[in-house]
């Protein structure tokens, strides 16, 4: 059974992940059109289901494309380099989902824009945090 200290650690990691994803989203929302329009042609895959920490596997698999689009649409909107930002997220995701069980991610048929993708994972973090508090 999860201890209060492990629950607290999970909560803090999720809050950190949430802040990183929100920072990226805020940076993107600061782009002026038509640059934002161009970024929205970059496609992301969404999880069919995202209700448990193991489903973060689906986020992990899309981190490389996320780093790519942030590099390609390079901007001064981010304080950290995309590589460092995504590396930080990757470390948190790996810790949160754990490596004991191998989970095969199932993706939805519809793809998403970067904004929809980030919003989906922000909602996921918020939802899990709310169950822990």
């Amino acid at each position: 059974a999860p201890t209060s200290s492990s629950t607290k650690k999970t909560q803090l990691q999720l809050e950190h992940l949430l802040l990183d994803l929100q920072m990226i989203l805020n940076g993107i929302n600061n782009y002026k059109n038509p640059k934002l329009t161009r970024m929205l042609t970059f496609k992301f895959y969404m999880p069919k289901k995202a209700t448990e920490l193991k489903h973060l596997q689906c986020l992990e698999e899309e981190l490389k494309p996320l780093e790519e689009v942030l590099n390609l649409a390079q901007s001064k909107n981010f304080h950290l380099r995309p590589r460092d930002l995504i590396s930080n997220i990757n470390v948190i995701v790996l810790e949160l989902k754990g490596s004991e069980t191998t989970f095969m991610c199932e993706y939805a048929d519809e793809t998403a824009t970067i904004v929809e993708f980030l919003n989906r994972w922000i909602t996921f973090c918020q939802s899990i945090i709310s169950t822990l508090t």
Partner: antibody, heavy 121, light 113 residues
């Protein structure tokens, strides 16, 4: 090896329909846009439009909108270009090319060998 | 649509000598205030499919020799070949991908003198 293999040459009469294909292999076909480019005899390259096979999102150049249909079958990693009623002016070489996860942020890095379409009565 | 204009139409070259092709766009190809320049160069060798040479203004595509280089800014761009080789003959095209629809230049035919 990453490649796009196109269907063979076609000779058609005006008014006939036609569907040519472009099969991808060696990469995740559903995660990259596939564009179509026309080259009329002795002329330059014209960008016709593009499809994302993962969700069949399709965009057409205004010059080709309503003239052709671009589609894809992700289960067999194949993109298509089709005409419902060919004209003599459709005579050209047609190329498919891969264009990454965003056609604004990637060049066309892999090309098919081209399909020659001849329309003559 | 963004119109891409290439000069010259034809370029006779001597092997071992440098060569230069120009491309001009009707508007800046810079992706935002601090972004990349969304311009590519392609080469179509006789009887072959086009191939990507240079992407995003100045990055050489995989396997492209370092004698090819791309430069420029805003609306004026240049493809340089430092020392032309016989295998470099063909038609060179610039292409913008800043705005939809993507558009190619008319092409520059490079041939050996």
């Amino acid at each position: 090896e990453v490649q796009l293999v196109q269907s063979g040459a076609e000779v058609k009469k005006p008014g006939e329909s036609l569907k040519i294909s472009c099969k991808g292999s060696g990469y995740s076909f559903t995660s990259q846009w596939i564009g179509w480019v026309r080259q009329m005899p002795g002329k330059g390259l014209e960008w016709m439009g593009i499809i994302f096979p993962g969700d069949s999102d399709t965009r057409y150049s205004p010059s080709f909108q309503g003239q052709v249909t671009i589609s894809a079958d992700k289960s067999i990693s194949t993109a298509y270009l089709q005409w419902s009623s060919l004209k003599a002016s459709d005579t050209a070489m047609y190329y498919c090319a891969r264009q990454g996860r965003s056609y604004h942020y990637y060049g066309m890095d892999v090309w098919g060998q081209g399909t020659t379409v001849t329309v003559s009565s | 649509d963004i119109v891409m204009t290439q000069t010259p139409l034809s370029l006779p070259v001597t092997p071992g000598e440098p060569a230069s092709i120009s491309c001009r766009s009707t508007q800046s190809l810079l992706d935002g205030d601090d972004g990349n320049t969304l311009l590519d160069w392609y080469l179509q060798k006789p009887g072959q499919s086009p191939q990507l040479l240079i992407y995003t203004l100045s990055y050489r595509a995989s396997g492209v020799p370092d004698r090819f280089s791309g430069s420029g800014s805003g609306t004026d761009f240049t493809l340089k070949i430092s020392r032309v080789e016989a295998e470099d003959v063909g038609v060179y095209y610039c292409m913008q991908r800043l705005e939809f629809p993507l558009t190619f230049g008319g092409g520059t035919k490079v041939e050996i003198k």
